[in-house]
Structure formats: C-alpha cells, structure tokens
Interface confidence: low
C-alpha cells in the first residue's frame, strides 16, 4: 500500500498546533485510503527545507526568497502548489515588482543614478531586494556594505528600517527611517506617498499599490512605470513592464520522489472542506493564534504548479538575477555598454558541432549551450543559461508565451536589401508521390504520414490545425495508420515509421533521421504516403542537389502537391496549391539581450553569411548539407523585424489563432508552464 501521508513542516509552536488541527480535521473528512497529514516541527524555514531534502518531511509553504534557497543545491526542491489571492475567477498567484515615476520626469531605468528613491523597507522584496538586486552591478564599488553603495548611488532615499546613524542618506527623505506605519513613508503605500509628495523621484512597490492608492484613472495617468528595456509604460501595463514577477507563497517539495500529486490532492481536498467560507470549526486560511500560520491568511485557495516548472522558471529570470546578485555579489568585469558573448542554444550532437565551429570562427562572440529538445532550449534561454536560437514559427509561439521576443527573421529570397526587408513567409505544403495518383487531401485517413516534428509550423501546426477543423478531435495517431512525427509519444503510431535507433527513435532532433524538412521528405521517399513540409523542400532534395545516397537520384517530377480543394498540382505550382502561408523562422531571445543579439548576429552574418562564396573551405553560417542546423540552409540573411517585434505581431493574427485552436491538442509541457505564469 503506497504511503499517502504528507509530512508538513511547521516552524513554530503555533504552526505546529495549527498543523495538528489540520491533521485531525482532514482525518474526519477524508476516507481512510485518502491522503493524510503528519506534522514535523523544525526551528526555522531553512531547517524545514533541509528536512524535506533529507526526506524527513515532505512539504512547507515559502515566500519567494526562500523558494530560491530551497531550489539551490544541495536542497533541489521545486514548487508544487501555489497559493492564490483575489477571486476564483481571476486567481492571482504572482505579483509584479515595479518602479513607479511621475509622468513628466523624463529619465529611464538606466538613468537612476543620482535620483531620489522611495523604498517600502530595507530587505523587503519589491521595495529593496528586487530593485537593488537588478541595479547591483551599476552600484559604485565597493558594493559592501550594500547600504553604503546604495546611499552613494541615489542622491537621497527613504528606506525604512535602515540604520539612520550609519547610513543617513537612506533616511534623508523620511527622517528617522522608522520601521512601522508611524513612518508615513513606510510600506507599499508609504513608498508611493514618498513619490506622490515629491520627496522621491522613483518608488519601488508592487503593481497593485498605485491602484490601491489612486482610485481615479486620471490621477493614475500622472504616473508611469520604468521598464527594464529603458522605456516607460502606463501603470496598467505592468505585465509588460516590471522589474520582476514574484510568486506570493508556494508549497515546495523534493524534485525526485517528492509526492507532488499527493500534496496537490491533499491541499485540493483541504480547500474543498476548509477553504475560504467553508467551515466554522477549522479554517485553512486563518490563524487564531498568530499570523499566516502554514498558509497566508489572505490566501483564497491553491493552484497546482505545472510539473514542467522548476524553481528557476517559476521565480523568473529577473527575480533569480536580482536575488543571485544580492547573494553572490558578483558582477561581470566587462563594461555594461559592451555586449557579452551570445550563448547560442544547439540541439543535440550535430548542431553542437556546427555551433562549436561557429564559436571558434567568431573569436569568442558566440558560445554554445546544448539541449536535447527545442523546448529545453527555450527553457534555457528563459532562465539565462542560453541567450538565443532560431525557431520555427510554432516554437516562436511557445517562446513568445514564455516571455521571449523575436529579434531577427530568416529570409529565404535573394534581394538587394535583404536585411531590411523581412519576408511575408513561406508555404506549408503536402507532398505525395506522383505514382499514388488516387491520393487527395480528402482521403488521407489511414495513410502513412511524415512530419517535420510535433509543434512545428509546416510539419504539424498547419496541417493538423486544418485536420482538426475537419475531424474535431486530437487523435491524429488514429487518423493516420502510422507515421513519423518526431516529438510524439514513443508508443504512438506516429513514431512507428521513424528511423532513429534506440533512444533516438522519434526524438525531435537530428539524431532522428526523419526529423525536420529533409527528414520528413526522406520519410515520404522511403516509407510514407504524404509529407508535410515547406515549398522549397522538394527542389532542395531532388535533381542531385542533395548528394546523400537516398536522395541523389530523385526527380522533382515524381512528386506532386495536394491542394485543399481536393486536386493535385506539380511541385512548382506551390503558390496556387498550399495549405497555408507560414511565418519564416526567427531568432528569439530574452528582452534584456535583444539589442546585443541583434548587434552580434548582424556582425556574424556579414562575416559568415551568404556572401561567403566557398563553403567547402570556409565556415558558412547558413549551410549544413540540407540538415538545417542552427538555421535553415536556404537562409539568405537575417532580416530586421522593424515593428513586428513581439511574437503576436511577428506570427500574425491568423497563425496565432490557428496555433491557439490547436492548443486543445497540445502536449507541450513548457507551454502549460508558461501559461501558468502568464495566462
């Protein structure tokens, strides 16, 4: 019988008492085979974290800063359940730390030196740790003691709870630096009042502060937010302009064998029986003998944290950066106006080889980071382990949902001003053998299909989106008799045709021979009935243009396209016989790296782009013997996006809508995790 006990960690006598009450009340409402509570008492949260890591306890609820500690080795804990606030209809699990300024003040985030600052209190998250952590590397040296460095950075501050004797500048705007509401500039509302009264130039608070203090929109319009990309936005655009997105209060557990499903089941039942307004005899979100015991008193319920979400992703890049800066106190030696090397994310062995070669040729401008799947790469870019990669439109969508931005687009047509003119896109097509003359778009059921990979544009999102509209279900593996769609579940019929050996079978990388455009076409040539690829794939792999043994004798005339009206056309007539127009592949990065990635990639393509005439002796960025490594092999240049600089604008409304519809069928654990942070 599996042990269905969750050992909750309590950090005080009062918490232990509430825990015992929690245990007893849960026993009375849960069947004997359901989850149960046991209580473990420790002296501090850090002791609880260590106890959970050592398998002496299973769960504890922590503030964001402690979630960071819990995640660090050797603890390796992960968030499993989040408290939420507000209503069930619009649950808030995060708050946003923001920098508020008056509208007419005219400076940006990178011009805060010498300004006057208002803080909620020394050592508090939104008011101190996050802004000072993010500004840490701009502070004058020596940066220790931190209070002195901050005092020397701003021309005056109000930082309640600071030592006014040792650091008088931190109390200049609020004499005495009182650490309670007796100080009119203490806390969220106090820091905002400090700005409102004109004492300070910037207030570091949370996103709701301005709404709680100014009910009138006209009054709120006198203020703006400073964004990390050195722009400003209106105060209601905090989701796109904040210093960090911070989880409020989170249950953590072990990453391996952490009972996360059991913890969720326990807490979900607990909130059913003892949540807000549920029971008189025991209340989960109430602390008669103290405040915020086990859970925050202000919480309204729990939400399950998606399993793909580790602590780094949950806390977010900005928050982790701020806290790490404060804790580790290390800053890069390079001056901040100079770009650090761009860490390119390479998929599997083949891309890594090409990336390493690029790195050597770039003389240190490019570094390489490896991952096994595109989603793993996106996650690494999110958390700062990597900086950039070029993605198919389907993954640009996921990356965008995860907060990344497109920075340059691959262009596939030669033109005089290639770098200035991003193209409208390429065509997604369905290719069949000419000899299979009875095959049409309308009778694909039961046939063998070849896809570039699950989640990619031409190979999956467009054809499966069209198919979904027709069949109204997600059982694509039943619609086709078998196929190869790398990234499918290994036991799926859509892995049956794949050719990868052992663990590489059906993997969404080049270790699977039928991966990508060329791989999907090869799958058609050797085993399949239909391949979903781009309009250039057939000409690029026929007529001797691909020297590989399977391709060298192929003739374009032996293949035809399926049109949506049930007819067929020759391959060269793709403009009148395609499934949809697909957005070109694009390079994505984090917002904070956008300018540097743009600058370095433009330098790199001038050195190694399509102007290099001899790729047999020189490194060519856009060549890899039809394997599309790092970039598509038919890339002519990387083009500026101009105003199409968000994933929605880049992909276009129609494609975003199509992928949105297909999300019903999505198996992307990363997309699930990212929509938890930003629904």
């Amino acid at each position: 019988v599996p042990d269905k006990t969750v050992r909750w960690c309590a950090v005080s006598e009062h918490e232990a008492t509430k825990c015992q009450s929690f245990r007893d009340h849960m026993k009375s409402v849960i069947p004997s085979d359901g989850p149960s509570v046991a209580c473990v008492k420790k002296a501090s949260y850090l002791d609880c974290i260590r106890a959970i890591a050592a398998n002496e306890a299973d769960a504890v609820t922590l503030d964001a800063g402690l979630v960071y500690d819990a995640y660090l080795a050797p603890n390796n804990l992960k968030p499993v359940v989040a408290e939420f606030y507000g209503s069930k209809e619009d649950p808030q699990t995060f708050y946003y730390a923001v920098a508020v300024v008056k509208k007419d003040s005219g400076f940006q985030m990178n011009q805060l030196r010498g300004k006057k600052s208002c803080h909620t209190g020394l050592g508090r998250s939104a008011g101190w740790n996050i802004p000072i952590g993010l500004l840490y590397c701009d502070l004058p040296e020596p940066r220790k003691p931190l209070e002195k460095a901050v005092a020397n950075f701003f021309s005056g501050s109000c930082a309640p709870c600071a030592d006014g004797t040792d650091f008088p500048q931190l109390c200049q705007l609020c004499p005495g630096c009182g650490c309670s509401t007796l100080n009119q500039y203490f806390g969220y509302s106090g820091a905002f009042k400090c700005l409102k009264d004109g004492a300070g130039d910037v207030a570091f608070v949370k996103h709701s502060t301005i709404f709680e203090n100014l009910a009138n929109k006209a009054d709120r319009d006198q203020y703006e937010l400073l964004c990390l990309d050195n722009t400003r936005k209106p105060v209601d655009e905090y989701k796109d302009c904040h210093l960090a997105q911070v989880p409020s209060h989170t249950v953590v557990a072990r990453s391996m064998g952490g009972k996360e499903d059991l913890i969720w089941e326990l807490l979900n039942q607990a909130q059913e029986h003892f949540g807000k307004d549920k029971s008189k005899e025991f209340q989960l979100f109430s602390s008669p003998h103290g405040k915020d015991l086990l859970f925050k008193d202000s919480a309204h319920g729990f939400l399950k944290v998606p399993p793909r979400m580790d602590a780094k992703m949950y806390l977010g890049y900005e928050y982790v950066t701020a806290i790490r800066n404060l804790r580790e106190g290390t800053c890069p030696e390079a001056p901040t106006d100079e770009c650090k090397p761009v860490k390119w994310c390479a998929l599997s062995h083949h891309e890594r080889l090409k990336c390493d070669e690029w790195s050597v040729n770039s003389v240190g401008k490019i570094e390489c980071v490896s991952a096994e799947t595109t989603e793993d790469c996106i996650a690494k870019i999110m958390n700062g382990e990597a900086d950039a990669m070029s993605l198919d439109g389907g993954f640009v969508y996921i990356a965008g949902k995860c907060g990344l931005v497109p920075v340059l687009a691959e262009n596939y047509n030669k033109s005089d001003n290639c770098e200035d003119t991003p193209e409208a896109g390429y065509f997604a097509i369905a290719v069949v053998k000419k000899s299979a003359s009875d095959l049409t778009w309308d009778n694909l059921k039961g046939k063998k299909s070849c896809h570039t990979a699950v989640g990619r544009t031409a190979g999956w999102n467009i054809p499966m989106g069209l198919l979904y509209n027709k069949i109204n279900h997600c059982r694509f593996d039943e619609f086709f008799s078998e196929g190869c769609a790398p990234g499918s579940k290994k036991d799926s019929s859509l892995c049956k045709l794949c050719m990868g050996s052992g663990l590489n079978l059906c993997e969404p990388n080049n270790k699977e021979g039928y991966y990508g455009y060329t791989g999907a076409f090869r799958c058609l040539v050797e085993k399949g009935d239909v391949a979903f690829v781009k309009h250039q794939t057939v000409p690029q792999n026929t007529g001797g243009k691909n020297p590989d043994p399977w391709a060298k004798n192929l003739n374009e005339k032996d293949y035809e396209l399926l049109c949506l009206d049930g007819t067929r056309k020759p391959v060269e007539e793709y403009a009148n016989c395609h499934l949809a127009r697909a957005p070109n592949h694009a390079v994505v990065t984090r917002k904070d790296k956008e300018a540097c990635v743009h600058k370095i990639l433009r330098q790199q393509q001038h050195l190694f782009g399509s102007n290099v005439t001899d790729c047999s002796g020189n490194f060519c960025l856009f060549r890899s013997e039809t394997k599309d490594l790092l970039f598509r092999d038919d890339t002519v240049c990387l083009a500026k996006l101009h105003d199409r600089n968000t994933y929605e604008k880049y992909l276009g409304e129609e494609y975003v809508k199509a992928v949105g519809n297909l999300r019903k069928c999505s198996t992307s654990s990363l997309l699930e995790a990212c929509t938890f942070r930003r629904p």
Epitope: G34, P35, L303
Partner: nanobody, 128 residues
Framework: EVQLVESGGGSVQAGGSLRLSCRAS????????MGWFRQAPGKEREGVAV????????YYADSVKGRFTISEDNAKNTVYLQMDSLKLEDTAMYYC?????????????????????WGQGTQVTVSS
C-alpha cells in the same frame, strides 16, 4: 479523441434508486478529475459528485451527501454514481465530465468550469 459515454438514467419513484455509469475512452485513465454534474430545467449546471481517478478522493455536493456514492472501476475506465433515497428535486439531466490537463487548476473539483470533456447526458426523472 477523448469520449465519455453515460448510461443508466431513467424514471423512478421518490425514495428509489438508480445507478449511472460513465465510460471514458481515448486517454490514459488515472490522475484526473471525473464525475457527475446535473442540470434541471431553468437552472445552472451544478456539481454532484467527483473523484480523482486512479484511486483518489471523492467529493460530493452537500445536497447529495449520504444518499449518492461515486465509485470507479479502473480496469474498465468507468465511473459510477449510485443514487439512493432519490428525491423529486434530483430530477435533472445528469452529465459525466472529465477534467484533463490545465483544467485541474480550478479551485473546486465541483466547479463545472474545470471540466473540458463532457458526455451527452442521461435523463433522471423522480416522480411522486
């Protein structure tokens, strides 16, 4: 495609019993919320009884506690609702529902919005 097929509805006298069945197909059974909702004419759809499949917990609306019992047969991917001591006010269309994926993020397992797969419904009529 995930499908839910209900059976077992019908007409019964007040105080009598009925047993509803709901079979799920097209997905890996276990680790999801599945259960019964009902909608009487002119009223909103309400949660009746739900369980966490694969041997998990059960949840009941206050109005049916002690009278209705939800259970499952893992091997058959089927959830049952045993309805005893039926009352006139139990008359409604009864729907089987399953919450897959992110639907589980809702706070209450008896909240209809948490469910993204629904059966066609089976009518239960209780007369005096």
């Amino acid at each position: 495609e995930v499908q839910l097929v209900e059976s077992g509805g019908g007409s019964v006298q007040a105080g009598g019993s009925l047993r509803l069945s709901c079979r799920a197909s097209g997905h890996a059974y276990g680790g999801n919320y599945m259960g019964w909702f009902r909608q009487a004419p002119g009223k909103e759809r309400e949660g009746v009884a739900v369980l966490y499949t694969g041997g998990g917990s059960t949840y009941y609306a206050d109005s049916v506690k002690g009278r209705f019992t939800i259970s499952e047969d893992n091997a058959k991917n089927t959830v049952y609702l045993q309805m005893d001591s039926l009352k006139l006010e139990d008359t409604a269309m009864y729907y089987c529902a399953l919450a897959l994926g992110s639907a589980r993020w809702y706070t209450s397992s008896l909240d209809a919005r948490a469910y993204n797969i629904w059966g066609q419904g089976t009518q239960v009529t209780v007369s005096s």
